[in-house]
């Protein structure tokens, strides 16, 4: 018996509008009902919860209306998506998946998506 | 699944000594990092000290009195607590997590990558 696994890409570039989207999916040893994913970022040796939410298997992802992420759940999938990166979150984001309900309990953790993000240079001001 | 159930606190003077022991079925420890936790009356739950295969990783206020160990071969870890002190009263909790490559000594114990957390056993330091 092993942990539970969850897999998520190993690198990601956010877009220039601070945006990075990236799948977790998990390998469900049982049928859960109650699932909560949580993300994580680690980052010079420092660990920050960046968001979370707990769904039931069927229904929408919701996260607290100031969260800096979105998401859509499909069968053992989550599409996760950051908004409002700038260069200074470049990291490790880590996928964190806990099947909550109906017992037993499981735990997984991804291996860490490496997001990158680079802020846009300034537009130059144009001279008329 | 993972189950964990901790045993071992109590009451003891300060200076005094008390073993946690924390005993897993349902699997095999090897693929986890234990760590123990701990939380008094109205602060956070903090890092006290975890073990994976190769690695121990201690909270500064208690390294040097504190010792964590394991024991694959029983499923169990064990957290000795030496020269007990008043702030060292509180709730203390077992939990696991799956050992991942990125953990560095600095980040493995983080409570937030834990779960299957015990219902914690109480631990009094007082004359």
């Known amino acids: 018996c092993k942990a539970m696994h969850v897999a998520q890409p190993a690198v990601v570039l956010a877009s220039s509008r601070g945006i990075a989207s990236f799948v977790c999916e998990y390998a469900s040893p049982g049928k859960a009902t109650e699932v909560r994913v949580t993300v994580l970022r680690q980052a010079d040796s420092q660990v920050t919860e960046v968001c979370a939410a707990t769904y039931m298997m069927g229904n929408e992802l919701t996260f607290l209306d100031d969260s800096i992420c979105t998401g859509t759940s499909s069968g053992n999938q989550v599409n996760l998506t950051i908004q409002g990166l700038r260069a200074m979150d470049t990291g490790l984001y880590i996928c964190k998946v806990e099947l909550m309900y109906p017992p037993p309990y499981y735990l997984g953790i991804g291996n860490g998506t490496q997001i990158y993000v680079i802020d846009p240079e300034p537009c130059p001001d144009s001279d008329f | 699944e993972v189950q964990l159930v901790e045993s071992g606190g109590g009451l003891v003077q300060p200076g005094g000594s008390l073993r946690l022991s924390c005993a897993a079925s349902?699997?095999?420890?090897?693929?986890?990092?234990i760590g123990w936790f701990r939380q008094a009356p109205g602060k956070e739950r903090e890092t006290v000290a975890c073990?994976?295969?190769?690695?121990?990783s201690y909270a500064d206020s208690v390294k040097g009195r504190f010792t964590i160990s394991r024991d694959n071969s029983k499923n169990m870890v064990y957290l000795q607590m030496n020269s007990l002190r008043a702030e060292d009263t509180a709730v203390y909790y077992c939990?696991?997590?799956?050992?991942?490559?990125?953990?560095?000594?600095?980040?493995?114990?983080?409570?937030?990558?834990?779960?299957?957390w015990t219902q914690g056993t109480q631990v009094t330091v007082s004359s």
């Open positions: 939990a696991a997590s799956p050992d991942k490559p990125f953990y560095t000594d600095q980040t493995m114990c983080n409570k937030h990558y834990y779960g299957y």
């Open positions: 349902g699997s095999t420890l090897d693929p986890f990092v």
């Open positions: 073990i994976n295969r190769s690695r121990t």
